[in-house]
């Protein structure tokens, strides 16, 4: 390294140091750059700007440093293709602001900016965060106010500094299948830069029209179809100081369909069902025609899912111990207020042992069971029962 | 492990109602009905009813139904019994249960020793 | 309902004796019963749930039989931790209801 002559030397394996005062103007293009994890720059008073494609080709670097150069201008997305940066110190440059956007997305484990004109605003409340919160190493010196002498502002009691304030307005109305929905994001804050709708869930829900610009923002959904309910539509906004997103769910009404399946013997016997509807319907089981009275032996159960967007529900009708008693035909009846289904499904537990021949003796010894019961409960069990 | 949690005395006045609490932990709140079981002192056991977590649903002995009213909160994993318009009759032992890995109850509260008297 | 009855409503033995306690139901539960122990001022413990089937850490010494209406809980070789009050219980649908039990006492 010392034998070097070039305007960048190699240091180790996989470094690089740029020293040679005034011989840089840029980072575009830096020759054996591909596997760089460390790049150190130093007296390039014509470095001035760190562009989006300056660091193309770097994605191994984990640290940068461009120190005592004429650095001025970070561009919000120039850390895009160095995505394993973990320690960036740009200290003693001419920097006077450093947009959150610049290092949103990296795992920075320390951030040196000292010895920068760094001046106060909105748009470094950010950093005054990350050092009062101690997020990663943050190493400044005291922020500049213009006033000459003015020291270390608390950008935190400057009421006009934040992030946007986002709303959705919503139809009051049910939505229903075939209908026409009209969303209005609407944006506030100081120095709005951009807006948006995130729509990745909506795919074949409906058509999307966007309208309008901020800081209103309209989105026309046409002939919704039932599957966006629980779909996330999300209004973004982003300013100076940072990034806001809210979500809202249109709930689209729809008819309560139900669909009934074998009973099988889990742990317990279970005679498997999936309901859809929005509104959520309401469920009523009934047994040979009469209302089915839950209890701890006979009760419906809903499964866990892992899908939380989604309207339809999964469950079983859960039988502990159930014994020929409790052979017979099963209803679910689903019902909102758009409309009502019914699904059947025969099901045998156990043999009868009262069925007997004419001419078998009669079994004195046992009592006539209740046979209206639907309460009555075999099957040993591995797991709680409940 | 499966625990159910219960205060160890009330002492109320006739005619007053109480609430009782059931704390429970290490298992899965929701997905397993409680049971109330009273006994008097030197005295058997008395299934009262149930409920279920997941959605409230309540069965009674026939005797209990004016008497003994069973709620849930579920974000405190508790369940309750009021008993109201209480006598000497109602002194006793309340403990709350729940089944284990079949339908008998392998799991009881430490009871609550409740005391009607003037 | 369902009435259990148990039998009988007291026992003395002594320590390394055989017991046998006795339940018998209104009507046919299967092999629906349960027994439980109870000591003063403790809380019940599972014993036996499905006629036979012993509860987690139950001694082997405890076993039951029966089917139908008529069944027992018999104790081979009392240990002075098995004196207190038995209590026979159906498990066969809502609403569930105990025997009046049998208290064991030491002779």
């Known amino acids: 390294a010392a034998s070097c002559r070039e305007t960048c030397c190699p240091v180790g394996p996989s470094g690089l140091r740029c020293t040679r005062a005034g011989t840089l103007n840029t980072l575009r293009g830096l020759r054996g750059a591909g596997n760089l994890t460390e790049l150190y720059v130093e007296n390039q008073r014509d470095l001035q700007r760190l562009e989006f494609e300056d660091l193309q080709g770097l994605g191994e670097l984990r640290s940068l440093t461009i120190v005592k150069s004429g650095l001025r201008f970070v561009a919000p997305d120039a850390f895009h293709f160095t995505p394993r940066l973990s320690h960036l110190n740009l200290s003693s440059n001419a920097l006077e602001s450093l947009s959150w956007k610049t290092v949103q997305g990296l795992s920075l484990q320390d951030l040196t900016l000292s010895g920068n004109p760094l001046h106060c605003s909105c748009a470094l409340l950010w950093l005054q965060r990350w050092e009062q919160e101690d997020l990663c190493g943050v190493y400044t010196q005291k922020l500049q106010g213009s006033g000459s002498g003015d020291q270390f502002l608390p950008l935190g009691h400057n009421n006009s500094c934040g992030v946007p304030s986002v709303k959705i307005q919503m139809p009051n109305d049910s939505v229903e299948v075939g209908d026409d929905v009209f969303l209005q994001c609407q944006v506030e804050g100081q120095a709005l830069q951009q807006a948006d709708w995130i729509l990745t869930e909506l795919e074949g829900t409906a058509t999307m029209k966007k309208s309008g610009d901020l800081p209103s923002l309209g989105l026309t959904l046409v002939n919704v179809t039932s599957d966006l309910n629980k779909k996330n539509v999300t209004c973004w906004a982003e300013n100076d100081v940072g990034r806001a997103e809210v979500s809202v769910q249109v709930s689209v009404s729809f008819p309560a369909s139900v669909h009934l399946g074998k009973a099988v013997e889990q742990h317990h016997w279970c005679i498997p069902f999936s309901v859809d509807g929005q509104p959520a319907p309401s469920l009523r089981w009934f047994f040979n025609g009469s209302v089915l009275n839950e209890t701890s032996f006979i009760f419906t159960q809903f499964l866990e899912s892992a899908l939380t967007n989604e309207t339809m529900r999964h469950g079983c009708l859960r039988l502990n111990q159930p014994t020929h008693v409790n052979n017979g035909n099963y209803t679910l009846l689903a019902a909102n207020p758009y409309g009502q289904a019914a699904a059947s499904i025969m099901a045998a537990f156990m043999d009868n042992p009262f069925e007997f021949n004419p001419e078998d003796p009669i079994p004195v010894s046992f009592s006539p069971v209740d046979t209206n019961s639907t309460s009555r409960d075999p099957v040993e069990k591995k797991d709680e029962t409940p | 492990q499966v625990q159910l949690q219960q205060p160890g005395a009330e002492l109320v006045k006739p005619g007053a109602s109480v609430q009782l609490s059931c704390k429970a932990s290490?298992?899965?709140?929701?997905?397993?009905?409680i049971h109330w079981v009273k006994q008097r002192p030197g005295q058997g056991l008395e299934w009262i009813g149930e409920?279920?977590?997941?959605?409230?649903?309540?069965n009674y002995i026939e005797k209990f139904k004016n008497k003994a009213t069973l709620t849930i909160d579920k974000s405190s994993n508790t369940a309750y019994m009021q008993l109201s318009g209480l006598t000497p009759e109602d002194s006793a032992v309340y403990y709350c249960?729940?089944?284990?890995?079949?339908?008998?109850?392998?799991?009881w509260g430490q009871g609550t020793l409740v005391t009607v008297s003037a | 309902d369902i009435q259990m009855t148990q039998s009988p409503a007291s026992l003395s033995a002594s320590v390394g004796d055989t017991v046998t306690i006795t339940c018998r139901a209104s009507?046919?539960?299967?092999?629906?019963l349960a027994w439980y122990q109870q000591k003063q001022g403790k809380s019940p413990q599972l014993l036996v749930h499905n006629t036979k089937t012993l509860a987690e850490g139950v001694p082997s010494r405890f076993s039951g039989s029966g089917s139908g209406t008529q069944f027992s809980l018999k104790i081979s070789s009392l240990q002075p931790e098995d004196f207190g009050t038995y209590y026979c219980?159906?498990?066969?649908?809502?609403?569930?209801?105990f025997g009046a039990g049998t208290k064991l006492e030491l002779k």
């Open positions: 009507e046919n539960i299967y092999t629906y």
């Open positions: 409920i279920n977590p997941n959605n409230g649903l309540t």
């Open positions: 290490g298992y899965t709140f929701t997905s397993y009905w």
């Open positions: 219980q159906h498990h066969y649908g809502v609403p569930l209801t």
């Open positions: 249960a729940k089944y284990g890995n079949y339908v008998a109850f392998a799991y």
